[in-house]
Every structure is written in structure tokens, then in C-alpha cells.
Amino acid sequence: KVILDKYYFLCGQPLHFIPRKQLCDGELDCPLGEDEEHCVKSFPEGPAVAVRLSKDRSTLQVLDSATGNWFSACFDNFTEALAETACRQMGYSSKPTFRAVEIGPDQDLDVVEITENSQELRMRNSSGPCLSGSLVSLHCLACGKSLKTPRVVGVEEASVDSWPWQVSIQYDKQHVCGGSILDPHWVLTAAHCFRKHTDVFNWKVRAGSDKLGSFPSLAVAKIIIIEFNPMYPKDNDIALMKLQFPLTFSGTVRPICLPFFDEELTPATPLWIIGWGFTKQNGGKMSDILLQASVQVIDSTRCNADDAYQGEVTEKMMCAGIPEGGVDTCQGDSGGPLMYQSDQWHVVGIVSWGYGCGGPSTPGVYTKVSAYLNWIYNVWKAEL
């Protein structure tokens, strides 16, 4: 049975086996095509989601689809139902929390009262001044809180208490990539993790431990990427894994927050990386223990210099490392989070690519998560 499952796939009507390597190869090998059903699926980038949250106290902004302008939501007459609508528009199904925050002196956008129309937020038709003088601060999910704060040193062993959103993504029980829990159903990782194996069946997620082999595996229902372009293989290196059953959150299993749309991190901003990846370039083995390291944002201009990546780092990517080199993510860390701490922890990057590991002029390159918020929200909405 184990051997059969490992090497063969059972087609129904009529029942017969096909070699597992024929799964997800683009050919219908089973009469009903079920060999092509549970495969990595692509999902287009899609339209702008008409709500977003700003780094200014997680304040809600809404797009006026008639004029193409963003405006800030006034707290006047804002209700729980409107908060739920806003979060549903971003694909969240959890119960949101909201509060009033004072309009600051630097308020840039128009502040307008909100109403709802066919499950979408709209500006109220005769919206005059914002009488409360307050904006809506909205949180769609409690996220980014851990039981333990890491200490700032080079590379050290990590505890799951510090990083309860970190998961191991495994194929045939072998660790392939890292990933981050975003909500009870969804894990964020890198698309390149699935280049070799595009069938969903054998992929599993392990959450809740800092040791590689010691935690139960979770079944995966779907793996979603943006269309792969072989001309630009490093682009759009982002994937979402939908779990078959929702996670139960605990001290060691918790979600990390997505970044704000306007989360612009300046060079030298401190960040954290974690993973079970190789501890030495071109060799060694996966670390059994989760490792953590502090790094910093490296300026994109520096990262694209002639002695570095020569223009390969696009505006949807970011670089992080330490100027002198030696601290970096490596093979096996792919898909894991690059993290920034403000009030909560945010996943600002996904471990993606780099030349070697830890070289001074070639730091790690990460998928910039804020560039893909619309895509994430559109995927979630489609799966609600």
C-alpha cells in the first residue's frame, strides 16, 4: 500500500493505476481527468481591492471607484457590520476589531463617512465634514504576537515561542521550504518551492514546533501561485497554501500580520529571518533546529550594483542581509518570512533567491509582500 501510494496514483471509473509522475503534467491520463485536478493552480493578479490598511495606526482607506481616489474612513456612524464588510473585501472571515483614532496633523487623504452597498464599502452620498474628527483603525485578525521576543545577536537557535507562525513545508516527508501562517486556513510561501512537484497530494505542512521532525503534518487542499513566466523565473515568487482543515491557534501556532500597503522600509531597518535551511553554502545539511538571525534592509540601488545583482532586483523584490555578509538565508529557508516588528510582527518579505549564501555584495533577495497584497486578498476572496 505504501509503495503503491508512493509511486502510483489510482484513477477512478474504471479503477486503474497510473505512475505518480504523470500527475499534474498537463495531460489527462485518467479518463475523468482527476490526475490534473489537485495540482498547483495559477491565479491572475486581478483588480485593485477597494479597501486597504495604512501603517498610520492601521487606519482604513477606501477607493472611490467613480473617481479613482483613495480616502480615509471617518469614524462617524461606523459599525461592526461595516468593519466585517471591509475585512471580507480583503478576504478575511474572522471577527474584526475597530476603534476610533484621532485625525492626525499629517492627514493627507480626504476623510469621508462610509456606507455599504452590495457587500462593498462606499462613500456616503452626502458626505460633509467628519464630525467625530476620528478615523477608523481596523484589525481584521489578531496577528503578529508571540510569547517571546528574540534577542538581537548574529545567528542563534530559535524557539517556536518567538516565531509561532513559522511552518515547515514538506514533500514526501522531506522538508523543502519554510512558510508563514497568515490565518487559520492559509500559509504564505514561495512559488519556486513547487516547481519540481506540482501535485498537491504529497505536500504537507508542519506547524507548532522548532524541531524539524517532531510535529504532526497537516493536509493541504490547494496551492496557488501567480502564473509562472519562464522568461522571468525569479518574478512573482509567492504562493498561498490552503489547508484542508483550519488551524487551532495556540501559544505555538499563531498567524503573522501582512504588511500595510504603505510599509516602506528604509535601508538599515532591522529585520529578522528564520529557517531550517543549510547552515553552509553548497553543503552541510538542513538544520534540525530552527535558526534565527537579525539582518537589515539593503538599499535596492546597492543591491543592483555591478558587483551585485546588476539590475535583476525588481521593485517587487527587496534585499536584506548585513553589509559585511555572513548572515543570510540559504537553501531550505526558501518561502520563509522576512520579518519586521512594529507593534506586531509583519511578514514583509518571502525568502526567494540569491547568489550563494552570505556573500557581502550579494545579500538575500526577498519577494516584497506589500507588492502582492491585492493578489493575496483576491485569492482569499475567491476562496471565501
Partner: antibody, heavy 118, light 107 residues
Framework: EVQLLESGGGLVQPGGSLRLSCAAS????????MHWVRQAPGKGLEWVAV????????YYADSVKGRFTISRDNSKNTLYLQMNSLRAEDTAVYYC???????????WGQGTLVTVSS | DIQMTQSPSSLSASVGDRVTITCRAS??????LAWYQQKPGKAPKLLIY???SLQSGVPSRFSGSGSGTDFTLTIRSLQPEDFATYYC?????????FGQGTRLEIK
């Protein structure tokens, strides 16, 4: 303080081309739609074109459709109007204006004069 | 396209007078109507937005009213600096359209 500064106006022959620029500062340019509005000498205001905050949608007045192209570079905080096949009736002061949420135009540039004449 | 018709096209008044300018839309524009003041050689200045909301920094002698298709701009007690051209504008739908203007002159 919000500032909009147009440039690129001048004298051009009928059938010629001109590119206007509008440099924006003092606000989050990438969150606002931007407009061009013109005013012929001694006449009223005429809306010309709008571009959405991210450049994803553009709309034009019938009088300029197919001849004028609005564009923006959010990394440079700059709005553009490429004007081709210019006619005498395009002679006007061209203003850029920051889009507001259906609340009219609170912020305008000082205007740049385009004269189409042989 | 929505046509905006202002009346009168021009009017003469004295300092201290109460003046009313009307604007009619060819179809319903809700309350998405703005009023501007323009002086020669200058860019227009926003006075009223959303039909009746006073733009900050604009004197309270200016007021707006109306919704749907009929709108009014009222200047309660004319001051010397109020002599200018006034425009209404709808932002309910694209293309955005302006009224032809009302020139307010000193009597």
C-alpha cells in the same frame, strides 16, 4: 503644503506635438487621481482628462480623445499630458489638478499656456 | 454627458448685497457638486464641495444648497474681493463638466 507645478507649454504649429508635465509635492501622489483642465482665452473651464491613482484607468473629454494621452510616474511624483495633432482650438491655459473624492478640485497648479498657431 | 447650465451669465451688484447664482444639471448628480471662484490670471479656487459643505478657509458668507439637479450658490453680503467669475462643476460621473460661468461685476 500641496504644490502642483506645470511646465512644457509654448507655441506650436497646428498638427504639432507638445508634452506637458506637472510636478507634485506635499501629498501622497500615488493615492490620488490626477486631472488636466484647460481654459481657452476668455472662455470657461473645460475638463480634459483624468488618470487613476495607479495609472490603471484613464478617461478623456471627447474633444481630445485619440489625440491626447495622460500618464503618470508615481516614483517621480509627476503627471504628464502628451498632446499630438494639435489644433488651434487647443490653445488654452492647461492646469493640472489633484483629484478629490467627488468633491471638486481643491488643489490646482498655476497653469501653463499652450498656443497653437501657424 | 451631463450638461451644467448656470444662470445668470453675468450680474452686477454692490458691496453688501446678497447674491444668488443657480446651476442646473441635465441629470441627477446627487450632491456631487462644487462651486469655484476665479479671478483673472489665477487658477480657480474651491468654495463649496458636496453641494453645501464650505471648503476650509472660505468665508462663511458663502453658502451652497440643493441636490439632484438644482443647486444654488449664495453670497450673503458681498465684499470687494468677491467680484470674480463663478463656476459650478459636477463630479458625479466622467466626463467631469463645468457650468459656463457667471461673471459677477461691481454695479
Amino acid at each position: 503644503e500641496v504644490q502642483l507645478l506645470e511646465s512644457g507649454g509654448g507655441l506650436v504649429q497646428p498638427g504639432g506635438s507638445l508634452r506637458l508635465s506637472c510636478a507634485a509635492s506635499g501629498f501622497t501622489f500615488s493615492s490620488y487621481a490626477m486631472h488636466w483642465v484647460r481654459q481657452a482665452p476668455g472662455k470657461g473651464l473645460e475638463w480634459v482628462a483624468v488618470i487613476w491613482y495607479d495609472g490603471s484607468s484613464k478617461y478623456y473629454a471627447d474633444s481630445v480623445k485619440g489625440r491626447f494621452t495622460i500618464s503618470r510616474d508615481n516614483s517621480k511624483n509627476t503627471l504628464y499630458l502628451q498632446m499630438n495633432s494639435l489644433r488651434a482650438e487647443d490653445t488654452a491655459v492647461y492646469y493640472c489638478a489633484r483629484g478629490e473624492v467627488r468633491r471638486g478640485f481643491q488643489h490646482w497648479g498655476q497653469g501653463t499656456l499652450v498656443t497653437v498657431s501657424s | 454627458d451631463i450638461q451644467m447650465t448656470q444662470s445668470p451669465s453675468s450680474l452686477s451688484a454692490s458691496v453688501g448685497d446678497r447674491v444668488t447664482i443657480t446651476c442646473r444639471a441635465s441629470q441627477n448628480v446627487g450632491s456631487w457638486l462644487a462651486w469655484y471662484q476665479q479671478k483673472p490670471g489665477k487658477a480657480p479656487k474651491l468654495l463649496i464641495y458636496a453641494a453645501s459643505s464650505l471648503q476650509s478657509g472660505v468665508p462663511s458668507r458663502f453658502s451652497g444648497s440643493g441636490s439632484g439637479t438644482d443647486f444654488t450658490l449664495t453670497i450673503r453680503s458681498l465684499q470687494p474681493e468677491d467680484f470674480a467669475t463663478y463656476y459650478c462643476q459636477q463630479s458625479y460621473s466622467t466626463p467631469i463638466t463645468f457650468g459656463q460661468g457667471t461673471r459677477l461685476e461691481i454695479k
